[in-house]
């Protein structure tokens, strides 16, 4: 073509894959009439007619562009839709009159690659390898043109380094014309790289400018020999009996060696292997004082069969022994004195406290409780608490029952019980004393005795309410070798005037309790029995 050497550089049109390229014919009016133009695509220096414009009307030529071309801007612009990578070529428009002139357009196509996918070498890398080993592979799919890859370690770009770092990249062309880039990073790693963060970055261009995409960060398993093993105990701090204690072996090698935990036998001084769980952890639950002692860990490298021993670690499980109170079951006369002594052993300094069991009142701070001029009311429970102030929750207690010799003690002399005739009453009578009293009733009925504690007894009587019973009332008599005492239960007939709105006189079994510990008024509910003559 005459004068081709002097042709100006083609106009550059940049477009992303899938969008529409607007190819504007740049011929001036003097160079040609735009109402009569031919459009060509140039591929490998071969021109192919793809579109004709005649009297401002466009017509596609059969072929690959037939469906994607249209005329815009009053015939000056050819629109190419659904741009693909294969469309990256030169397009030219040629005016036919007054003389043949042409205008060239270079179409550049771009496509951002997908997010880079990074896969770490799952087998890991030994630190003593002779040449760079595969660390990770980075794949950038469906980009155009081929993106550039940069590898980073701990945020710093990696450069090729002989025998140390090698980056091996390759690409494949998909049927779509897009490129998939694969880059393999190979490196010689050191122990310190066990925590190193690697990632790859894809650099690519779009019509809007330069861009980049980063992969996620990965760490690669780095294998290095164990140099040291040690023991770790959880929880940290002071341990006490009852705690859940975990003793685990740790090593500075990867993979860790095979661990075993031993405890020194205090008698033989020999190390005896302990049984660990599946994770190699020795779990002491609940921890006991016998678990105290010297523990050590052995790490055996199954590849080299080299064995390493940890520094021994002393484990102290703090304890408070069973608390002993003497005398253990004191019996005293009224007016006498009593000294209660509390003893316990512990791995730490102990504090003692004496409390009254019934009230929780602190009576004494110290191991000895002295009680003088004992009254009957002084009988009952006293609790010694032995605790380790430096270890919250570490304490043991012992309850001692002080028995004061005396005749039975009734809480009341008399009580009124509301009843109806021909009802079965359930009456209760409770008495305390030392020795423990027995209870008898002055009427026939079904009586049962229940021991409440060493000095207290409860007797229950089921009795039918008769006119005679209403007249005499019911007496319960508690006796022991030191004397006897009586409580009287007066029975009063319920009638409409004595009923209060909240009275319950219709259901259940009548109950009346005479107890040293019950001060409330008795209530009475009852159930009707058949008339006496109808009972077999």
């Amino acid at each position: 073509v005459p004068g081709e050497a002097e042709q100006p550089a083609p106009e550059l049109v940049e477009v992303e894959v899938g969008s529409t390229a607007l190819l504007k014919c740049g011929l001036s009016q003097s160079q040609g009439n735009l109402s009569h133009v031919d459009w060509f695509s140039v591929h490998k220096e071969k021109r192919t007619l793809i579109f004709r414009v005649r009297q401002g009307q466009g017509q596609s030529e059969p072929g690959e562009y037939e469906q994607r071309l249209s005329l815009q801007d009053r015939g000056a612009t050819l629109a190419l839709t659904q741009v693909t990578p294969q469309d990256e070529r030169i397009f030219l428009c040629q005016g036919k009159r007054p003389r043949s002139q042409e205008y060239r357009i270079q179409l550049r196509v771009y496509k951002a690659p997908e997010e880079p996918n990074i896969q770490v070498n799952p087998l890991g890398i030994p630190v003593n390898s002779k040449e760079p080993e595969e660390v990770a592979t980075c794949v950038g799919r469906n980009g155009y043109p081929i993106p550039q890859v940069i590898w980073y370690k701990n945020g710093r770009p990696l450069k090729e380094e002989k025998n140390r770092v090698h980056i091996q990249s390759s690409q494949t062309v998909e049927s779509s014309g897009l490129y998939t880039l694969q880059s393999i990073l190979k490196a010689q790693l050191v122990k310190e790289d066990k925590d190193a963060q690697f990632y790859c970055e894809l650099n690519y261009r779009l019509p809007s400018g330069n861009h980049m995409k980063e992969s996620r960060e990965v760490t690669v398993p780095v294998f290095y020999p164990t140099e040291k093993v040690w023991l770790e105990v959880e929880p940290v701090g002071m341990l006490k009996e009852g705690d859940r204690v975990e003793i685990r072996c740790l090593a500075d090698g990867n993979p860790p060696p095979h661990f075993s935990i031993s405890k020194q036998n205090p008698s033989t001084r020999e190390a005896e292997e302990e049984t660990t769980n599946d994770n190699g952890v020795l779990v002491l639950e609940p921890a006991r004082k016998e678990h105290s002692g010297r523990y050590e860990c052995q790490g055996l490298d199954l590849d080299t069969m080299i064995s390493l021993l940890s520094e021994p670690q002393e484990l102290l499980v703090n304890y408070v022994s069973d608390v002993r109170v003497s005398p253990a079951a004191p019996e005293r006369q009224e007016g006498s004195s009593l000294t209660l002594t509390c003893e316990a052993e512990s791995s730490q300094d102990l504090e003692f406290q004496w409390l009254r069991e019934e009230t929780g009142q602190v009576l004494e701070r110290g191991p000895v409780l002295q009680l003088h001029d004992l009254k009957r009311e002084a009988g009952g429970g006293y609790r010694c608490v032995a605790s380790v102030p430096s270890i919250p929750g570490l304490n043991r207690t012992q309850l001692v029952n002080v028995a004061i010799f005396g005749p039975p003690w009734m809480a009341f002399k008399e009580r009124k019980v509301w009843v109806k005739e021909n009802m079965v009453l359930n009456l209760s009578c409770e008495a305390s004393g030392h020795p423990r009293p027995t209870i008898s009733w002055n009427v026939n009925g079904t009586a049962s005795e229940q021991d409440q504690d060493p000095q207290r007894v409860l007797s229950t009587l089921n009795v039918l309410v008769t006119p005679e019973l209403l007249e005499t009332g019911v007496e319960c008599t508690a006796s022991n070798d030191l004397g006897k005492n009586t409580s009287i239960l007066f029975l009063e007939l319920v009638n409409l005037t004595t009923l209060t709105p909240d009275s319950n006189t219709t259901t259940g079994l009548s109950t009346s309790t005479a107890s040293p510990h019950t001060r409330a008024n008795s209530t009475s509910t009852e159930r009707k029995l058949p008339e006496p003559e109808s009972r077999g």
Partner: antibody, heavy 118, light 111 residues
């Protein structure tokens, strides 16, 4: 220190009676119970009865009721076991023992041997 | 009556051995934390001697190698390390109700 000393044992003919004594010292006699326990030759221990010197209240093992009687002399701090209508099966060592209100025997006498034989 | 069954009736052991004697009551002898079971040692020609009272309390002056345990109906006397002076007959006794009864005894002999 607390001591209990039995006396009054010996050989006695069947059908006769015997009174055993238990002299106490070293504690307040009326504050504790006195029990009598029988041990036949080569056999185990058998509880007979108890007495509370403070009130003279007694309880007997049904097996010995009517045959044996307990009593005390507070002025002498001494307890007694009266044994009537003795038979060969009453041959045994008889112990007196002291207790509090939980009825365990913390102090025992050395025992006195009673042999019923014609 | 409440029956006491002691086992074994006799036992041979050596000095230093740990020995356990059990006593079973025909019904519970315990009341809210107190077990009315006691243990005695008797040597030939001597009176019984109180070792353990209320199931687990060591009588004053008794060596700590003796211990008692149990509640309800089943009780144990343990001698942690037999000494030559421990060869004797041992009795359990309940005081839960009248009449008080003793076990038939366990004779502990030198092996």
């Amino acid at each position: 220190q607390v001591q209990l000393v039995e006396s009054g044992g010996g050989v006695v003919q069947p059908g006769r009676s015997l009174r055993l004594s238990c002299a106490t010292s070293g504690y307040i006699f009326t504050n504790y119970w006195i029990h009598w326990v029988k041990q036949a030759p080569g056999k185990g221990l058998e509880w007979i009865a108890r007495i509370y010197p403070g009130t003279d209240i007694t309880y007997y093992n049904e097996k010995f009721k009517g045959k044996f009687t307990l009593s005390v002399d507070k002025s002498k701090n001494t307890a007694y076991l009266q044994m009537n209508s003795l038979r060969a099966e009453d041959t045994a060592v008889y112990y007196c023992a002291r207790s509090g209100g939980y009825w365990y025997f913390d102090v025992w006498g050395a025992g006195t041997m009673v042999t019923v034989s014609s | 009556d409440l029956q006491m069954t002691q086992s074994p009736s006799s036992l041979s052991a050596s000095v230093g051995d740990r020995v356990t004697i059990t006593c079973r009551a025909s019904k519970s002898v315990s009341i809210s934390g107190y077990s009315y079971m006691h243990w005695y040692q008797q040597k030939p020609g001597k009176a019984p001697k109180l070792l353990i009272y209320l199931a687990s309390n060591l009588e004053s002056g008794v060596p700590s190698r003796f211990s008692g345990s149990g509640s309800g109906t089943d009780f144990t006397l343990t001698i942690s390390s037999l000494q030559p002076e421990d060869f004797a007959t041992y009795y359990c006794q309940h005081s839960r109700e009248l009449p008080y009864t003793f076990g038939q005894g366990t004779k502990l002999e030198i092996k």
